[in-house]
C-alpha cells in the first residue's frame, strides 16, 4: 500500500482543481469570512498511527465529497471542474479504503478514532450550517472553498501517520 506518494499526488491535484474552481473574485467576499474551527489543535497534538490516519483522512475526504456533491454545489461551480474534483476525491477514497483492508484486515474496522472522526463531522456540520445561513451565496461558497483548501493542507500530521509503520 504505497499511500503516502499516491495520496500526496492526488491531494495536490485536488487542491489545484479546487483553486481553479473560483468563479468570483474573492476580494469581494471579505465580510463573509467565518470561523469554522478546523480541529487542528487536536490533530497537531496527536501522533497518528497508520490506521488512524487513514480513517480520519477518509472521513475528511468523504465529507468534502459529500459537500461538493449537493445540488447547491452543482449550481455554484463550473461543471467540468467540479466533476474532475469529485472524481479526484472519489479515487482518493478508493485508495484509502484499499489501504484500510490491507492494513487492518477485511473484518476489522479502526474504531480507536471516534473522537477525531466526530470532530471532523462537527467541523463539516459547521460549514454546512454556514452555507445554509448564507443561502448558498457565491461569496459563502468562496469562503468555504478557501477553508477546504486550508484544511486539506493542515492535515500534515495525518499524512505523517501514513508513513508510519504500525
Amino acid at each position: 500500500c504505497d499511500l503516502p506518494q499516491t495520496h500526496s499526488l492526488r491531494n495536490r491535484r485536488a487542491l489545484i482543481l479546487l483553486a481553479q474552481m473560483g468563479r468570483i473574485s474573492p476580494f469581494s467576499c471579505l465580510k463573509d469570512r467565518h470561523e469554522f474551527r478546523f480541529p487542528e489543535e487536536e490533530f497537531d497534538g496527536h501522533q497518528f498511527q497508520k490506521t488512524q490516519a487513514i480513517s480520519v483522512l477518509h472521513e475528511m475526504i468523504q465529507q468534502t465529497f459529500n459537500l461538493f456533491s449537493t445540488e447547491d454545489s452543482s449550481a455554484a461551480w463550473e461543471q467540468s471542474l467540479l466533476e474532475k474534483f469529485s472524481t479526484e476525491l472519489y479515487q482518493q477514497l478508493n485508495d484509502l479504503e484499499a489501504c484500510v483492508i490491507q492494513e487492518v484486515g477485511v473484518e476489522e474496522t479502526p474504531l480507536m478514532n471516534e473522537d477525531f472522526i466526530l470532530a471532523v463531522r462537527k467541523y463539516f456540520q459547521r460549514i454546512t450550517l454556514y452555507l445554509m445561513e448564507k443561502k448558498y451565496s457565491p461569496c459563502a461558497w468562496e469562503v468555504v472553498r478557501a477553508e477546504i483548501m486550508r484544511s486539506f493542507s493542515f492535515s500534515t500530521n495525518l499524512k505523517k501517520g501514513l508513513r508510519r509503520k504500525d
Epitope: P26, F27, L30, K31, R33, A146, E147, R150, S153
Partner: antibody, heavy 121, light 107 residues
Framework: EVQLVQSGAEVKKPGESLKISCKGS????????IGWVRQMPGKGLEWMGI????????AYSPSFQGQVTISADKSISTAYLQWSSLKASDTAMYYC??????????????WGQGTLVTVSS | DIQMTQSPSSLSASVGDRVTITCRAS??????LNWYQQKPGKAPKLLIY???SLQSGVPSRFSGSGSGTDFTLTISSLQPEDFATYYC?????????FGQGTKVEIK
C-alpha cells in the same frame, strides 16, 4: 520560519520607472495574499492594494489605482510593486505584508522590512 | 470608503500606567478590526486581530474590545518597550483603511 524579504532602498529621478520586490519564504506563497502599504515620511499607513499570487487577481485602493501596478511570480514566490513614471510625492517607505485571504486568520501577520524609495531631481 | 478615526492622536504616559486608545469606524465593521504597533524605523507588528484576538507572541497586557463602530486597545500596564505608534485597521471591505495613528510617548 515565515519571512517576507523586500528589495533594497532606491533613489530615482522623477519620470523614471521602478519595480520593487517582496519575496516570501517559510510558507505556501499561493495560500496567502500579499498587500502593499505606503508610509510617507512622518505619516501614517496607507493601504495601496493586494494580490492573490495563486491567480494574480488584484485589487487597488482608489487612491493608487492607475498609479502603480502590483504583480506576482508564484514560481519564485515573489510579489512586485511598480511605477512607470515616478513623482517626487512617491517618496516613501513601502511595505509588503501577508494576508490570509478569506480564511479566518490574522490579517497582515507578517511584514517585509520595508523598501525606502526616494524620488528627487 | 470606510473612515477610521483614532483618539487621541498622541498621549504621554508613565511606565506602569493603564493606557486606552479608541478607534471609531464610519460604518459598522462587525469585529473586522486589527491593531498594529510600529516603532521608529521598523515595520508594523500585528497585536490584535478580529477586534479581540491576541496575536501569537504578543504579551497579555495588550487587549482589544468592541464591535460595530467603536473599538478599544488597552495596555494594562505600560512597559518601556510599548512606547510606539499604534494603528487600527478595518478588514471588512476594500479598500482596507487604517486609522491615523496614536503616538504613545514617555511622560
Amino acid at each position: 520560519e515565515v519571512q517576507l524579504v523586500q528589495s533594497g532602498a532606491e533613489v530615482k529621478k522623477p519620470g523614471e520607472s521602478l519595480k520593487i520586490s517582496c519575496k516570501g519564504s517559510g510558507y505556501s506563497f499561493t495560500s496567502y495574499w500579499i498587500g502593499w502599504v505606503r508610509q510617507m515620511p512622518g505619516k501614517g499607513l496607507e493601504w495601496m492594494g493586494i494580490i492573490d499570487p495563486s491567480d494574480s487577481d488584484t485589487a487597488y485602493s482608489p487612491s493608487f489605482q492607475g498609479q502603480v501596478t502590483i504583480s506576482a511570480d508564484k514560481s519564485i514566490s515573489t510579489a512586485y510593486l511598480q511605477w512607470s513614471s515616478l513623482k517626487a510625492s512617491d517618496t516613501a517607505m513601502y511595505y509588503c505584508a501577508r494576508h490570509p485571504g478569506l480564511n479566518w486568520a490574522p490579517d497582515f501577520d507578517y511584514w517585509g522590512q520595508g523598501t525606502l524609495v526616494t524620488v528627487s531631481s | 470608503d470606510i473612515q477610521m478615526t483614532q483618539s487621541p492622536s498622541s498621549l504621554s504616559a508613565s511606565v506602569g500606567d493603564r493606557v486606552t486608545i479608541t478607534c471609531r469606524a464610519s460604518q459598522s465593521i462587525a469585529e473586522f478590526l486589527n491593531w498594529y504597533q510600529q516603532k521608529p524605523g521598523k515595520a508594523p507588528k500585528l497585536l490584535i486581530y478580529f477586534a479581540s484576538s491576541l496575536q501569537s507572541g504578543v504579551p497579555s497586557r495588550f487587549s482589544g474590545s468592541g464591535s460595530g463602530t467603536d473599538f478599544t486597545l488597552t495596555i494594562s500596564s505600560l512597559q518601556p518597550e510599548d512606547f510606539a505608534t499604534y494603528y487600527c485597521q478595518q478588514s471588512i471591505d476594500f479598500p482596507l483603511t487604517f486609522g491615523q495613528g496614536t503616538k504613545v510617548e514617555i511622560k
